[in-house]
């Protein structure tokens, strides 16, 4: 049940007042300084007003201090991601203080009650930070609160209540229910820290959205559109349907935010980049792969501080597992004529050939429809670094893959029984790499042969003018 005191109630004040029987009431929020990478180690419990543990456990006042805040839980035991995150922080920032905020007694409740407890836990963290600020050399600017799910909003409350401004809050798939559309003081928001970055991995426009859909930080990153995460489908997660439930899919997608953050800590040589875009559909079209005017950023720990006037929504694709990095390409295909297209959208595939590697056959997702006498933009991504692109194979799939397309083909045939065959004419493909920001134009191998029809392919090679660099910044150069 919710903590039975007002919203301004100080948790420790309430919990440490001795009862008539002098029975000690344990605090419902504990701060465990993880002094060792060893999971067996008990760590050090910090409490406001007690300086001895800080000395005994070598709390480094001048170093970065991370507070890891878990979310709602259905069990009394920490979830497995916590160890991975603590371990990754210790590996990356060897001198840092890593503090686990254990509020399990208040989080292991009905969800609504746990939500009601977030404010008081935020107060408790703020009180700890206010006390630490009284110490010489401790700076709130060195504090990084990392909150997962409900813990992200706890971090927001802490940032709101503390005297001063914490350096950074990272929200890892902040909880959605009871926070979506809430007032900025009742959820994580940009004014809770000097820099608030957020990863959204389980947002749903239909059904219950476990993660919050709305942007709540300075930058809000939506990997894979913020909803269906690769490797988290029923087939991937369950292995055998007999052994699992839909809750494993939910856990996989919701927790993916944590693993993306861990990835950014341990695989800093393989950073993932996100690109500013107004919405997921435009990103899927390949329109948003620019790094001009801070329009791209590293995700996770390596994110570059951006304090925009408005929330910045950013998108990227990822692999199904660590390292999550993929290489994004914008493909602009100018269709200058087409013949007898009927109702069916063509299904195109591309294979990219590079100096380092060749891609697999990649589908071109048609978000709306192919326009003729227009430039059609697509997004493709590869798991491997192809190096400099050399040539492209464009294939128009022959036999229809869906009953729906078969039906449309049959209808087309009834209306145009002597259909002389569908055909598209494409002279060139322009490619832009999201990761390097380099642009390249590819021309058909045979300038006389620019037509493609179902079941056929067209080959494109680098046009004579070669790479064209516009004054755009490569994220790999500019970002840390």
């Amino acid at each position: 049940s919710p903590v039975p005191f007002g919203p301004e109630g100080r948790l420790e004040d309430k919990l440490h007042k001795p009862k008539a029987t002098q029975t000690e009431v344990k605090p419902s929020v504990r701060f465990n300084l993880r002094t060792s990478k060893d999971p067996e180690h008990e760590g050090c419990y910090l409490s406001v007003g007690h300086s001895q543990p800080l000395e005994d456990c070598s709390f480094n006042m001048t170093a970065k201090t991370f507070f890891i805040i878990h979310g709602w839980t259905m069990s009394g035991i920490f979830e497995n991601w916590l160890h991975k995150l603590v371990s990754a922080l210790h590996t990356r920032e060897k001198d840092a203080n890593v503090v686990v905020v254990d509020w399990l007694p208040l989080a292991h409740q009905l969800y609504t009650d746990a939500v009601n407890n977030t404010r008081v836990v935020g107060h408790s963290i703020a009180r700890m930070l206010d006390w630490l600020q009284e110490k010489d050399d401790f700076s709130l600017g060195n504090v990084h609160l990392i909150g997962y799910s409900l813990g992200a909003h706890v971090a927001g409350y802490a940032g709101n209540f503390v005297k001063g401004t914490v350096g950074r809050i990272t929200g890892l798939d902040p909880a959605g229910p009871m926070f979506e559309g809430a007032d900025i003081h009742k959820r994580l928001s940009p004014d809770d820290a000097d820099f608030v970055d957020v990863l959204h991995t389980y947002t749903r426009s239909f059904g219950l959205s476990i993660g919050i859909q709305m942007p709540v930080g300075h930058i809000d990153i939506y990997p894979n559109g913020g909803d269906f995460q690769p490797g988290c489908g029923l087939n991937d997660v369950l292995g055998s349907i007999a052994y699992g439930t839909i809750t494993e899919v939910v856990k996989c997608e919701h927790e993916r935010a944590v693993h993306l953050f861990v990835d950014s800590l341990v695989n800093q040589d393989k950073p993932s980049f996100a690109f500013q875009c107004t919405d997921s559909n435009r990103f899927k079209k390949g329109i948003c792969l620019s790094c001009r005017k801070n329009r791209c950023n590293s995700i996770g720990y390596n994110a570059k501080k951006m304090r925009n006037k408005r929330n910045s929504k950013m998108y990227l694709k990822t692999r199904a597992g660590m390292p999550f990095r993929v290489y994004h390409y914008q493909m602009k295909i100018h269709v200058f004529s087409y013949k007898n297209m009927g109702e069916i959208e063509p299904t195109f595939y591309v294979t990219l050939y590079g100096t380092n590697a060749d891609s697999q056959t990649l589908p071109l997702e048609i978000v709306e429809r192919i326009e003729q006498n227009a430039t059609n933009t697509f997004l493709v991504y590869t798991e491997e670094d192809l190096g400099d692109l050399l040539k492209i194979q464009l294939t128009w799939e022959g036999a229809s893959q869906s009953w729906y397309n078969l039906w449309k083909e049959f209808r087309s045939y009834l209306s145009q029984p002597r259909n002389p065959g569908r055909e598209l004419n494409i002279r060139r493909i322009r490619v832009k790499s999201g990761e390097t920001q380099r642009k390249l134009t590819f021309c058909t191998e045979d300038p006389e042969n620019t037509s493609i029809s179902p079941g056929r392919e067209l080959w494109f090679r680098k046009c004579r003018d070669g790479w064209r660099m516009k004054n755009e910044t490569s994220p790999t150069v500019e970002l840390p």
Epitope: P39, E42, G76, I77, N80, L82, H83, P105
Partner: antibody
């Protein structure tokens, strides 16, 4: 040094209940989770559930959820596992095991309690 | 639930030789894999945790590797006291599950 001492062997009839105790010493009982694992003759180890002694929060294996109850007495640094509606296939050695800080691995185990279910 | 598979029920190796035991998870468990040794009539003993982290008091000849779904426990030079049953266990998600065990016997 860390020690987990379990109660003695039990013989029970089908349908009865059994309550096994595990007394911890050598560490702060409330700082680590306590888990229960059983092993039927010739079978693999099977995790039954665990408790956070600090506030009593539990998590159970769905397989046993309706029949198992894990509790603790912090003043006695003791954890308990009660299994009800016993059947012959519950004949096994029952172990308590101390979790690491995150509750994932078990570095210390009790000596085991043999429970025999027989009519 | 995650199914842990130890493909070899029995492994016969001579003393002084190297033993390699494998464990496979039915889905990605990252590094949340622990190895135990059990001798007849005794409780299991933790050898390696979180895939590759060594435990104080455990001889250095025991080492672990792997991540994701494939894991290996290696005993570099078998001693007579190492002949026992070895179990792997995952703690990636509830319920925590164990492999069926590999019995390491003297060749």
């Amino acid at each position: 040094q860390v020690q987990l001492v379990q109660s003695g062997a039990e013989v029970k009839k089908p349908g009865a209940s059994v309550k096994v105790s595990c007394k911890a010493s050598g560490y702060t009982f409330t700082d680590y989770t306590m888990h229960w694992v059983r092993q039927a003759p010739g079978q693999r180890l099977e995790w039954m559930g665990g408790i956070n002694p600090y506030y009593g929060g539990t998590t159970y294996n769905e397989k046993f959820k309706d029949r198992v109850t894990i509790t603790r007495d912090t003043s006695a640094s003791t954890a308990y596992m009660e299994l009800s509606s016993l059947r012959s296939e519950d004949t096994a050695v029952y172990y308590c095991a101390k979790g690491d800080y995150y509750g994932g691995s078990y570095n210390y185990w009790g000596q085991g309690t043999t429970v025999t279910v027989s009519s | 639930e995650i199914v842990m598979t130890q493909s070899l029920a029995t492994l016969s190796v001579s003393p002084g030789e190297r033993a390699t035991l494998s464990c496979r998870a039915s889905q990605d468990i990252s590094n949340s894999l622990h190895w135990y040794q059990q001798k007849p009539g005794q409780a299991p003993r933790l050898l390696i945790y979180y895939a590759s982290q060594s435990i104080s008091g455990i001889p250095a000849r025991f080492s672990g590797s792997g991540s994701g779904t494939e894991f290996t426990l290696t005993i570099s030079s078998l001693q007579s006291e190492d002949f026992a049953v070895y179990y792997c266990q995952q703690s990636n998600s509830w319920p925590y599950t164990f492999g069926q065990g590999t019995k390491l016997e003297i060749k």
